[in-house]
């Protein structure tokens, strides 16, 4: 009779290397009296004898993976146990190969000049793919605009009419290479005005003619304001050359007023506008004299109602030829591309951005504008709106406007005055004011685990992108 | 001038409870968010509660989740800490620090006033 | 939960010399980071809040910097005062946590 034998396992598990949807086997040969019972796991994890993906023969020495699937990556034990002696084990990995495969490609894109483009070129492999690009015919040169990401995204910076095009990606490791689709890569440019119209100081049944030119792709459409309202009266010519529109107004001046010429052009679902403004005066006729930095008025406007503190004075900015038409236009803007973020980000860049370009402010001999707190920018750029901060803060720094006018509505945060220095001199905004049950969700940067009273739900991915290409990376 | 006084400490038995006082002057706590600061016998410091009373939200340390209560009076301008079911490691020198604005906007503007701290000795 | 990982754990150094303590955060984290001070039986004291904002009335001597996820208090010229031990500090909404803490001595 044969004397009881504690298991050993004679051949150890090695690592095996497998492609993805191809057979792998693990022998774990063992010797022992009586015969063991073999159990296979994965990472820690028993495999289940049942389990039909995988085959157990060979009295449970042979494990075999049917069809390889990436997830099976891991550690594969086999542990023999016969009752005699201690149970044995013996580990090895299991490393999935795959031919590269790209798993998000590039997709089309209309982006605008001198914003940020990001074409996705997401890809699976073992080993890591590589990823290049080609642009038209040529494989596409790094320099210091365009960049391969690691992800293997192409970002290129400050986008040029030049780098319009067809695009596709490519995946390539040891395995094999793969390809996307072309992708066309269109530019359109803001509008934007190349020659304002002048101001004029006239005698009474003068006629002045206003010429205003602007620019764009698509060459954008001149429209002239007379006093906040449509033009009422005189005559307006227009040519278009080389995406250039030139637009002339022929006045009969009868009464002073404020001329502005609004030239817009369309991107996608969204509009691009540029504006700028003349007065014409009548020789004679007072004016009121405004302080040459500003002043301080009750807020007329429409877009910041619901924000800013009921009959607050705030702050009207001179060195814009008419401030409180320009402060609402530059909001305007910028409330427009609000309606694309997320719900959490939206109160609060609201309240950044009307605080910031309607500041309150302190009459006296000198207007005083005060700023927001520079916490609260923090909270709204890292907290609230960590994704969306980047792509608004490109757009503002373009400078959509000319003629002494560009949309900054994206404070610097490090440049705004500390709670600490003074907490009367700087703003604080009444975005917080959440309802607990409201907050859904907080950007992954926040913290790895917020307190209880705070679900932790998946980051927003929305941005105030024009396309899907304008997006932080 | 802006003042934090703790209060409160002492020794007590492994699990029983002990209430901390932060009375605080020359700021509101209704504008402010509190903290508790504990820091064992040559130790590090280690966080242990939050409150922004405007908005009534706290927030606690995963070691004292369930055990301790922060809590504020604003008609009294003062922060509490319960603490039930204490443990020998929950032994400590307690502080009560403070930090401009609400929960938001705390953490960028740190903790800039401290009290003096309380004494917590848990041991049978 | 977010680690502050703090080097060095303790230093030596003279009177006049540039001392720098960095703190590496676990992950990506906002720009919400302290540094305090703190002296034997004392309270600590805040010397930079916003990773680089100067408290007031701390020495300029004082600096803080970020660079990714590291997080650096540099004391340009140590002064005898300047000897004690110092944290860093980072909040989320809310989960603060503290390095372990940089005790400086003199050498």
């Known amino acids: 009779e044969k004397l009881p034998k504690a298991p050993v396992i004679t051949t150890p598990l090695e690592t095996v290397d497998a492609l993805v949807e191809e057979v792998a086997t693990f022998m774990c040969a063992v010797e022992s009296y009586p015969q063991p019972e073999i159990s296979w796991t994965r990472n820690k994890i028993l495999i289940k004898l049942f389990d039909t993906r995988y085959s157990i023969r060979e009295n449970g020495q042979l494990l075999t993976i049917l069809s390889v699937e990436d997830s099976d990556d891991g550690i594969y034990c086999c542990i023999a146990n016969n009752g005699v002696g201690g149970a044995v084990e013996s580990c090895g990995a299991l490393q999935v190969k795959m031919k590269p495969k790209i798993t998000r490609p590039p997709i089309n894109v209309k982006i605008i000049e001198g914003l940020k483009a990001v074409l996705p070129c997401t890809t699976m492999g073992n080993p890591k793919p590589s990823v290049s690009w080609i642009k038209g015919d040529n494989a596409l040169r790094e320099n210091s605009r365009i960049a391969v990401l690691e992800s293997g995204s192409l970002r290129i910076h400050n986008v040029q009419k030049e780098d319009a095009g067809q695009y596709r990606c490519v995946a390539k490791n040891s395995l094999g290479t793969a390809y996307s689709k072309l992708v066309k890569l269109e530019v359109e440019v803001f509008a934007r005005i190349l020659r304002a119209p002048e101001s004029h100081n006239v005698t009474f049944g003068s006629f002045v003619t206003l010429r205003c030119t602007a620019i764009g792709i698509p060459v954008p459409t001149i429209s002239w304001i007379e006093n906040g309202n449509a033009v009422s009266s005189g005559s307006i010519q227009e040519s278009v050359k080389d995406r250039v529109i030139d637009s002339r107004l022929q006045l009969f001046i009868t009464k002073p007023g404020l001329y502005t010429c609004i030239a817009t052009n369309k991107h996608g679902e969204k509009f691009s506008t540029a504006k700028a403004a003349a007065t014409v005066s009548i020789a004679e006729w007072s004016k009121s004299q405004k302080d040459s930095q500003g002043y301080c008025a009750q807020y007329r406007g429409e877009v910041c109602d619901a924000v800013l503190a009921k009959d607050a004075l705030v702050f009207f900015n001179t060195s814009y030829r008419d401030p409180e038409d320009a402060q609402e236009l530059l909001i305007h803007t910028a409330w427009n591309e609000l309606k694309a973020v997320s719900p959490l980000c939206r109160p609060a860049a609201e309240a950044l951005l009307c605080n910031h370009l309607f500041q309150e402010c302190s009459p006296g001999v000198v207007p005083t504008p005060m700023p927001i707190c520079r916490e609260y920018c923090l909270a709204v750029k890292e907290l609230f709106c960590a994704k969306e901060w980047q792509a608004m803060e490109g757009k503002a720094h373009r400078g959509l406007y000319r003629s002494g006018m560009h949309l900054l509505p994206v404070p610097e945060c490090s440049k705004l005055p500390s709670m600490h220095r003074d907490p009367t001199a700087c703003t604080r905004l009444p975005y917080l004011d959440y309802k607990k049950e409201n907050i859904t969700t907080f950007p992954s940067i926040t913290s790895s685990r917020p307190s209880a009273d705070i679900p932790n739900l998946p980051a927003s991915t929305s941005s105030f992108a024009v396309s899907p290409a304008y997006s932080m990376t | 001038e802006v003042q934090l006084v703790e209060s409160g400490g002492g020794l007590v038995q492994p699990g029983g409870s002990l209430r901390l006082s932060c009375a605080a002057s020359?700021?509101?706590?209704?504008?402010?968010?509190i903290h508790w600061v504990r820091q064992a016998p040559g130790k590090g410091l280690e966080w242990v509660a939050s409150i922004s009373s405007s908005y009534g939200s706290t927030s606690y340390a995963d070691s004292v989740k369930g055990r301790f209560t922060i809590s504020a009076d604003t008609s009294k301008n003062t922060a509490y800490l319960q603490m039930n079911s204490l443990r020998a490691e929950d032994t400590a020198v307690y502080y009560c620090?403070?930090?401009?604005?609400?929960?938001?906007?705390?953490?960028?503007?740190?903790?800039?006033?401290w009290g003096q701290g309380t004494l917590v000795t848990v041991s049978s | 939960d977010i680690q502050m990982t703090q080097s060095p754990s303790s230093l030596s150094a003279s009177v006049g010399d540039r001392v720098t303590i960095t703190c590496r955060a676990s992950?990506?984290?906002?720009?919400?980071v302290a540094w305090y001070q703190q002296k034997p039986g004392k309270a600590p004291k805040l010397l930079i809040y916003?990773?680089?904002s100067l408290y007031s009335g701390v020495p300029s001597r004082f600096s803080g910097s970020r660079s990714g996820t590291d997080f650096t208090l540099t004391i340009s010229s140590l002064q005898p005062e300047d000897f004690a031990t110092y944290y860093c500090?980072?909040?989320?909404?809310?989960?603060?946590?503290f390095g372990q803490g940089t005790k400086v001595e003199i050498k």
């Open positions: 020359g700021f509101t706590v209704s504008s402010s968010s």
């Open positions: 620090a403070r930090s401009e604005g609400d929960r938001y906007v705390s953490g960028y503007s740190g903790l800039d006033y």
């Open positions: 500090q980072q909040s989320g909404v809310w989960l603060i946590t």
């Open positions: 916003s990773a680089s």
């Open positions: 992950q990506s984290v906002s720009s919400a």
